[in-house]
Interface confidence: medium
């Protein structure tokens, strides 16, 4: 039955997710005539392309081609044949060629070139590659989760279809974590937002929202790490570190070149009398804690109240949905239920983080000991960073819900980019007869298209 | 004090082996890590290799790199030195020297061990 | 590699004199640099390090000091027991390098 012309009337649409670590395919699939509804569409497919990043193939883009081979083939195996012409591709890169543009335009411009090139060769629409700003980033996964949640509905079920949806149309802050960058985006209540930067305007199904969003870059997970590295070897006694964010027994040498590779460790490089150091895990969640906060300069604050950095955050309001990264290293820790309490996930960690490696290479034979072994520091850093970076309290934990799928569709901001570029999501609630182009949700940021 | 303590220097044909030790004392050896330097007969001195103080990075001369194996054994407090394929240029006064950074780099230094490479 | 040239070769001064001695790092060393003392039939003396901290238990007279990529060795008032070989070592990146040395000798 595959690539034979389906019965129903039915769109799909493509968007690749080229993030820092991997890149990963989603298949979208929605009925033709039902386009303006919310909650329609929904993901039939997740393809992960095998590799890193896009941006590590700086220099050997040669080999994109067939990087997105696999997935690319896959798309035209889901997608009937009949559609393939009509089919929109996106790709929108995220921090990684952010950090890759930060040290050389140049370097970047080629990388997506040759993407763009790769992606022009399939029979799709190909709609253009390109780095999407980390404000998009926040509010397209905004957009994706109260999507999915039905919160641009007017109607009112009475019936949730998610375990932790409040039955009324609050929208959910959304919290994304990636591996170099992190989002908060959510509806203040009744407050300014006092930086500009930080205030995005939507007008969504004829309903006016003032959202803040903010993406803190060098915040991911992965390169997080790489700055709390390049912060402690600076104060170490010889090539050895001692980490308390690895489990007792582990044993890593790291190239200082790889250290700072990265625009993130920038502002802890030093010439240091050795090009390689070990890092030693002695499995202390606390002393990692007291770690990570180094990396959240809380000092200065220009607004009247901040995240870190000097970043304007309002008050906290409402549930939040935690996704990606923020999902994935809670599933892992076995921390995603609605009744763990912030403690009892503290107390979790200090008990995994002391845990000694070869139990812990043991236990969990099936995981990769690169991931493996980063588990204590990923869920200390986003303890750290959901308590001390966004100022969640015990109490307001209990809003933070960790979301991998809603209703089959997983969260994150590729959802909210399709729906926002194939003009999904009008700006006033649809009547019976379809509406201009000119009344659909613009983002105010301005998107180039290459048409192939 | 600290006290470091070579051997194992002696004249050796061309393509043969030879093994130095260093022995240490008066300090915590596991801690620091260990070089060896030598001094040919009337020139300065030339940086041979580094072990780190688990054993798990090592660093070479490229003069020395293929044929010589830089070790230790910290239960016996001991650096040493496995030189292979020995060759005329190899002769030297051979020191061990301690490193930790960042006041501790090459602070002590051995009295030396002789190594001639002669047919 | 980095390269230490090291000047001069060889000095010969008289007790009290003052006494330089200069080492040039091809490329940035950030002050990661040692000045060693050699005798005949004794171990390697570290005189100074990093570049310009007195090893404890090293007279005073001896002093480092750094300026861009040169660094110097001073001994303000030479006695007879400073009548030696002196190296510059830089410990910023392998290999390790060393300056030629200064044969420090009695006028």
């Known amino acids: 039955t595959q690539n034979k012309a389906l019965p129903e009337n039915v769109k799909y649409g493509i968007v690749l997710d080229a993030g820092s670590s991997h890149t990963s395919l989603y298949i979208y699939k929605w009925p033709a005539e039902k386009e303006n509804d919310t909650g329609v569409v929904h993901q039939v497919e997740e393809c992960r392309v095998k590799g890193p990043g896009i941006s590590k193939f700086v220099q050997k883009v040669n080999e994109i081609g067939i990087y997105l081979t696999d997935c690319m083939e896959r798309a035209r195996e889901v997608i009937p044949r009949s559609q393939h012409q009509e089919t929109p591709v996106y790709l929108g890169a995220t921090a990684g060629m952010r950090l890759l543009r930060m040290e050389s335009e140049e370097l970047a411009d080629r990388v997506l070139d040759v993407v763009e090139r790769s992606l022009s060769n399939y029979p799709f629409d190909f709609q253009g590659a390109r780095i999407i700003t980390g404000q998009e980033e926040g509010a397209y996964g905004w957009i994706t989760i109260n999507y999915l949640l039905g919160k641009f509905s007017q109607k009112t079920r009475w019936f949730s279809i998610v375990p932790y949806e409040t039955n009324n149309q609050e929208t959910f802050g959304a919290l994304d974590l990636g591996g170099a960058s992190t989002q908060v985006t959510f509806v203040p209540q009744n407050q300014t937002i006092e930086s500009p930067d930080n205030a995005l305007q939507f007008r969504l199904y004829g309903k006016d929202y003032n959202v803040y969003t903010h993406s803190f870059l060098c915040y991911g997970k992965d390169q997080a790490l790489w700055q709390k590295l390049a912060k402690d070897i600076q104060v170490a006694s010889n090539e050895i570190l001692r980490d308390p964010c690895f489990h007792p027994g582990y044993k890593k040498v790291v190239n200082v070149s790889d250290l700072y590779k990265t625009p993130c460790t920038k502002r802890f490089e030093m010439t240091l009398p050795f090009q390689q150091f070990e890092i030693q895990g002695i499995g202390n969640y606390q002393q990692c804690h007291q770690s990570i906060l180094e990396l959240f300069n809380t000092s200065y604050c220009p607004y009247s109240q901040c995240a870190f950095n000097g970043i304007f955050l309002p008050p906290l309001q409402g549930d939040f949905g935690a996704f990606s990264a923020f999902y994935f290293v809670m599933k892992f820790l076995n921390l995603t239920s609605e009744k763990v309490s912030q403690e009892k996930v503290t107390e979790m960690m200090k008990k995994f983080c002391a845990q000694p490696w070869e139990e812990i290479k043991t236990s969990y034979a099936g995981v990769k000991e690169k991931y493996l072994s980063e588990y204590c520091f990923s869920g200390t850093y986003i303890l750290s960073l959901l308590l001390q970076g966004y100022h969640f309290t015990a109490d307001s934990w209990e809003h933070i819900h960790f979301i991998g799928k809603i209703q089959g569709s997983d969260a994150g901001w590729t959802l909210g980019y399709m729906l926002n570029l194939t003009n999904m999501i009008p700006a006033e609630q649809p009547l019976s007869t379809p509406l201009s182009h000119s009344t659909y949700v613009a983002h105010h940021h301005h998107h180039h298209h290459h048409h192939h | 004090q600290v006290q470091l303590v070579e051997s194992g220097g002696g004249v050796v044909q061309p393509g043969r082996s030879l093994r130095l030790s260093c022995a240490a004392s008066g300090f915590t050896f596991s801690d620091y890590g260990m070089h060896w330097v030598r001094q040919a007969p009337g020139k300065g001195l030339e940086w041979v290799a580094y072990?780190?103080?688990?054993?798990?990075?090592?660093y070479y001369a490229d003069t020395v790199k293929g044929r010589f194996t830089i070790s230790r054994d910290n239960s016996k407090n001991t650096l040493y030195l496995q030189m292979n394929s020995l060759r005329a240029e190899d002769t030297a006064v051979y020191y061990c020297a301690r490193d930790l950074y960042y006041d501790h780099v090459l602070d002590y230094w051995g009295q030396g061990t002789t190594v001639t490479v002669s047919s | 590699d980095i390269q230490m040239t090291q000047s001069p070769s060889s000095l010969s001064a008289s007790v009290g004199d003052r006494v330089t001695i200069t080492c040039r790092a091809s490329?940035?060393?950030?002050?990661?640099l040692n000045w060693l003392q050699q005798k005949p039939g004794k171990a390697i003396k570290r005189l100074i390090y990093?570049?310009?901290t007195l090893e404890s238990g090293v007279p005073s007279r001896f002093s480092g000091s750094r300026s861009g990529s040169d660094y110097t060795l001073t001994i303000s008032s030479l006695q007879p027991e400073d009548f030696a070989t002196y190296y510059c070592?830089?410990?910023?990146?392998?290999?390790?390098?060393f300056g030629q040395g200064t044969k420090v000798e009695i006028k």
């Open positions: 070592l830089q410990y910023a990146s392998y290999p390790r390098t």
């Open positions: 072990i780190s103080s688990g054993s798990s990075i090592m």
């Open positions: 490329q940035e060393v950030s002050g990661y």
């Open positions: 990093a570049a310009s």
